[in-house]
């Protein structure tokens, strides 16, 4: 009974619910993540426990500092929900649920080029497709390492397309594309495709 009274005596502003967060919210399978459980009251000795559904994953004590739980997301069911419990001697509170979004990384995209050659111009169509990776995928096209398109979002497994017209160039142009989904800091590039300079029959991608 005393413990219950003691807990009731701790006003909500003195011992509110803890906060559970992670710097990484979108992850791929096999990724190591850190989860932070923190509390507004910095002068209490707090025991933090982390749960995934009803499974207890670990316990840490601290005062003034968040508890840091390091874990690896290897299976789909490990996406969550996670919950953190903050406990003082006679009182405990739970955080809101936290879940990760598991995303499959994009594989290196394939760049295809189609060219219609006129006397003065080249009409170039670039196609880029990554056959694996969670949708949506953002594609960006590059010419000589400079982005020439905005990010093109594809919500289906269809190639992104970008058209450009160029005066018949005197120099080689190198094209490549980038595929990126919601995984932060994880982008892949196609192999570069070199478009030869004009002169003779040097247009292997041209439609005759």
């Amino acid at each position: 009974r005393k413990a219950v009274l003691d807990c009731e005596a701790m006003k909500t502003n003195e011992f509110p619910s803890p906060c559970l967060d992670s710097k990484t919210k979108v992850v791929m399978k096999g990724q190591n993540v850190s989860m932070f459980c923190s509390h507004k009251n910095k002068s209490l000795q707090i025991t933090y426990s982390l749960f995934r559904r009803k499974t207890h994953l670990g316990t840490q004590d601290g005062k003034g500092e968040p508890a840091i739980f390091n874990l690896s997301i290897t299976e789909a069911h490990e996406s969550g929900p996670y919950k953190c419990k903050a406990q003082v001697t006679s009182c405990s509170k739970y955080s809101r649920d936290f879940s990760f979004t598991i995303v499959d990384p994009v594989t290196s995209p394939v760049l295809n080029i189609m060219v219609i050659q006129t006397e003065t111009d080249r009409h170039i169509t670039l196609h880029c497709l990554s056959v694996n990776g969670s949708l949506p995928i953002n594609y960006t096209f590059f010419e000589n390492h400079v982005a020439i398109s905005p990010a093109i979002s594809k919500y289906d497994r269809e190639p992104a397309e970008f058209n450009l017209t160029k005066k018949n160039p005197g120099e080689e142009e190198e094209y490549r594309c980038e595929a990126k989904n919601r995984l932060p800091n994880y982008a892949t590039y196609s192999h570069p495709v070199t478009m030869p300079s004009t002169g003779g029959d040097s247009c292997p991608f041209c439609l005759k």
Epitope: K42, S43, L44, Q45, Q60, K63, G64, I68, T89
Partner: antibody, heavy 119, light 110 residues
């Protein structure tokens, strides 16, 4: 009356080991964190580490590896295991209950136990 | 580890003087800061805990203030028994942070 009493100090040869005990009375070890602090002769206070209520342990970076803190709640005792001792580990070793804010309680220290590392 | 920088490292003062000792933490330690008084051959004695709370039995001439990284211990009117060494201690601790002591301030008779 709450009390902490250290024991286990004494003379030890360089490279040797020693286990210090901190017997706690009037305090429930499952309700408070207890830390270890040392003071070399003529020097300042040096924080070694702390063991929390649930048993998580944190060390000063210099103490990791050679020093190990543990506790036995049933005996209401906290331990400091010290390995590979060196002359510079000669000091008075104190255990102390950590400050908490509910109920508002200041820290409480033992009287200290002297460890001398010498051949 | 948190670094606690105490200043001055020593000071000379007379009975009745107002004495101020400062302590700066290298990281935010909130209000988790204690002040201790130590006399030769004795265990440290707690004066102030949680930055500003007076420990039991400590005279009211001792006071503490500050939060975050900057803290102050003030003795409003120095008494003969106050000549000693004073230490600050960060008492925050956890996964990413461990406490520590300042190097001490020796208060001597002028």
């Amino acid at each position: 009356e709450s009390q902490l009493v250290e024991s286990g100090g004494g003379l030890v040869q360089p490279g040797g080991s020693l286990r210090l005990s901190c017997a706690v009375s009037g305090i429930d070890l499952s309700s408070y964190a207890v830390g270890w602090v040392r003071q070399a002769p003529g020097k300042g206070l040096e924080w070694i580490g702390i063991i929390g209520r649930s048993g998580s342990i944190y060390y000063a970076s210099w103490a990791k590896g050679r020093f190990t803190i543990s506790k036995d709640n049933s005996k209401n005792t906290v331990y400091l295991q010290m390995n590979s001792l060196r002359a510079e580990d000669t000091a008075v070793y104190y255990c102390a209950r950590d400050v908490d804010s509910r109920p508002p309680t200041g820290s409480l220290w033992g009287q200290g136990t002297l460890v001398t590392v010498s051949s | 580890d948190v670094q606690m920088t105490q200043s001055p490292s020593s000071l000379s003062a007379s009975v009745g003087d107002r004495v101020t000792i400062t302590c700066q933490a290298s990281q935010n330690t909130y209000s988790n800061l204690d002040w201790y008084q130590q006399k030769p051959g004795k265990a440290p004695k707690l004066l102030i805990y949680q930055a500003s709370k007076l420990a039991s039995g400590v005279p009211s001439r001792f006071s503490g203030s500050g939060s975050g990284t900057d803290f102050t211990l003030t003795i409003s009117s120095l008494q003969p028994e106050d000549f000693a060494t004073y230490y600050c201690q960060s008492t925050s601790w956890g996964s990413s942070y461990v406490g520590g002591f300042g190097q001490g301030t020796k208060v001597e008779i002028k």
